[in-house]
């Protein structure tokens, strides 16, 4: 914490300007009025403060706003945003996309993924849902940021907005996030023709259930190996050799390259070796001919 001193009369601050860069930390603490700072935040980013000086300014704002900064201040934080922790940001209520854009620009090139994720979360909470304008802002200013949101937050995306999401925006999404987004995409794209539908739904397929993958295998989609490898293990395991062959089409040869990686490895272990042999790829590890495998881990009959 900055040591408290009295401000010398000649150093009293009446406006936020460049003269402040010559103030020592102690002088800034003593002479800058927090309310004045908050009122003139729009000037701060144009002044080349050192990181140490920015620490003092942040301290002043923290004292003035212990419950979290108002959006009028947040909007003009500029490089002061780089000093914020996720805990600080969690106190904010942000509704303006201009504020979001400004802070996303500042964060570019800095290791601030936790802060950015928290900021986006606050915006979604503040706006009530992840609407089209918010998604458009994220995809434009922060590709991949969509996946920083929790499944709970993503559940507020209306299906009508899904069309604005690009494949690269989903690259870092995990299975739990795709579980939320996939059914929305399935609803959003359901009126498209088969080939157009597959192009649109492909980035979301990591959240698809087995029956949807089986249905795709009947539609000559020729799924690429990268997409196949992102399918849920649980969605792939029930597929037959014939279904996988139909699903992948000419890309089926890629199974050999991925033979040791999940979900291909796990799928191979569930297939009869003579069925695998029909692919002519030399895949090994299937159930030997004549063996009967009883899976007691799941109480189910084949349906």
């Amino acid at each position: 914490d900055v040591e408290r001193t009295t401000c010398p009369p000649e150093k009293e601050v009446h406006e936020i300007d460049e003269s402040l860069i010559f103030y020592k930390k102690r002088e800034l603490e003593a002479c800058v009025d927090a309310a004045l700072l908050a009122a003139q935040m729009d000037r701060v980013d144009a002044i080349p403060f050192t990181y140490e000086q920015l620490d003092v300014l942040k301290h002043k704002l923290d004292e003035l706003y212990p419950q979290g900064y108002p959006e009028s201040v947040i909007r003009h934080l500029g490089h002061l945003f780089l000093k914020m922790s996720p805990e600080d940001i969690r106190k904010w209520n942000v509704t303006s996309l201009e504020t979001l854009k400004a802070l996303l620009k500042v964060s570019k090139g800095h290791e601030m993924s936790a802060q950015v994720a928290t900021l986006i979360d606050r915006v979604v909470v503040g706006r009530g849902q992840l609407d089209k304008d918010t998604v458009d802002t994220l995809t434009a200013f922060c590709p991949g940021c969509l996946c920083s949101l929790s499944p709970e937050r993503l559940s507020s995306v209306p299906p009508s907005v899904i069309g604005a999401v690009r494949p690269q925006d989903l690259d870092t999404c995990g299975p739990r996030q795709l579980d939320v987004l996939y059914p929305k995409a399935r609803l959003a794209f359901q009126n498209m023709s088969g080939s157009e539908y597959f192009v649109k739904i492909r980035p979301f397929l990591g959240g698809a259930p087995t029956e949807d993958v089986k249905a795709l295998s009947q539609q000559n989609v020729s799924m690429d190996l990268a997409t196949f490898m992102k399918l849920r293990r649980e969605a792939v395991l029930p597929l037959t050799v014939a279904e996988v062959q139909k699903l992948l089409g000419p890309h089926v040869e890629g199974l050999k390259v991925e033979e040791q990686h999940s979900p291909v490895r796990d799928w191979i272990l569930k297939q009869r070796q003579d069925d695998l042999d029909t692919l002519g790829l030399g895949l090994q590890g299937g159930i030997p001919n004549g063996y009967l495998i009883l899976d007691l881990s799941v109480r189910e009959a084949l349906s």
Epitope: S155, R176, P183, L187, N191, P209, T210, E211, P238, S303
Partner: antibody, heavy 122, light 107 residues
């Protein structure tokens, strides 16, 4: 042949929580989406919400604040909890399977349980 | 939410005759509409999806038509087992919504 069976108390007191379970037999719960639908006596059908085996859910905004749908893959079951019930929640509650095929890409139901009547009364 | 309205509320038709049931959506649902049949004390049974595609095992006398906001379920020659309540359901958007039902009774 996949079958669905609802189970739970037939009588719930006002302001309490209604709890129902649907057991899926003859197939894996992992392959589809599963829904709850209810029907008040002599009235139409109302979709409550669905769940995926991973736990991902979506529910009717009119009930969202009171609804929790959960899944237990080890038991091949999914459950409904509806809190703060009133007489208006008296209905036959059905669990149902969403058809789940991209070929017909739709959120409609090709398999239903027999339904269980839940009465809300003190 | 999309409101589905069915008409008439009750339809009286003689066995062997044709029955025509209507369903209207408050906004376009494209062809994302299903029809169900429900008999007393039973769960609904899927008849039609995609507005016009018969579900597995449904007799050819059941047919569906329409798109956008106006839909029709036609039963060409009524059998005794067809007298029941029929519901339409849209799946163009969440929440999924059903019509209030049309009761088809013997005249």
């Amino acid at each position: 042949q996949v079958q669905l069976q609802e189970s739970g108390p037939g009588l719930v007191k006002p302001s309490e929580t209604l709890s129902l379970t649907c057991t899926v037999s003859g197939g894996s719960i992992q392959n589809y989406y599963w829904s709850w639908v209810r029907q008040p006596p002599g009235k139409g059908l109302e979709w409550i919400g669905y769940i995926f085996y991973s736990g991902s859910t979506n529910s009717n905004p009119s009930l969202k604040s009171r609804v929790i749908i959960s899944v237990d893959t080890s038991k091949n079951q999914f459950s409904l909890k509806l809190s703060s019930v009133t007489a208006a929640d008296t209905a036959v509650y059905y669990c149902a399977r969403e058809v789940g095929r991209i070929a017909v890409a739709g959120w409609f139901f090709d398999l239903w349980g027999r339904g269980t009547l839940v009465t809300v009364s003190s | 939410e999309i409101v589905m309205t069915q008409s008439p509320a009750t339809l009286s038709v003689s066995p062997g005759e044709r029955a025509t049931l209507s369903c209207r959506a408050s906004q376009s649902v494209n062809a994302n509409l299903a029809w169900y049949q429900q008999k007393p004390g039973q769960a609904p049974r899927l008849l039609i999806y995609g507005a016009s595609t018969r579900a597995t095992g449904i007799p050819a006398r059941f047919s569906g038509s329409g798109s956008g906001t106006e839909f029709t379920l036609t039963i060409s020659s009524l059998q005794s087992e067809d007298f029941a309540v029929y519901y339409c359901q849209q799946y163009n958007n969440w929440p999924l919504t059903f019509g209030q039902g049309t009761r088809l009774e013997i005249k």
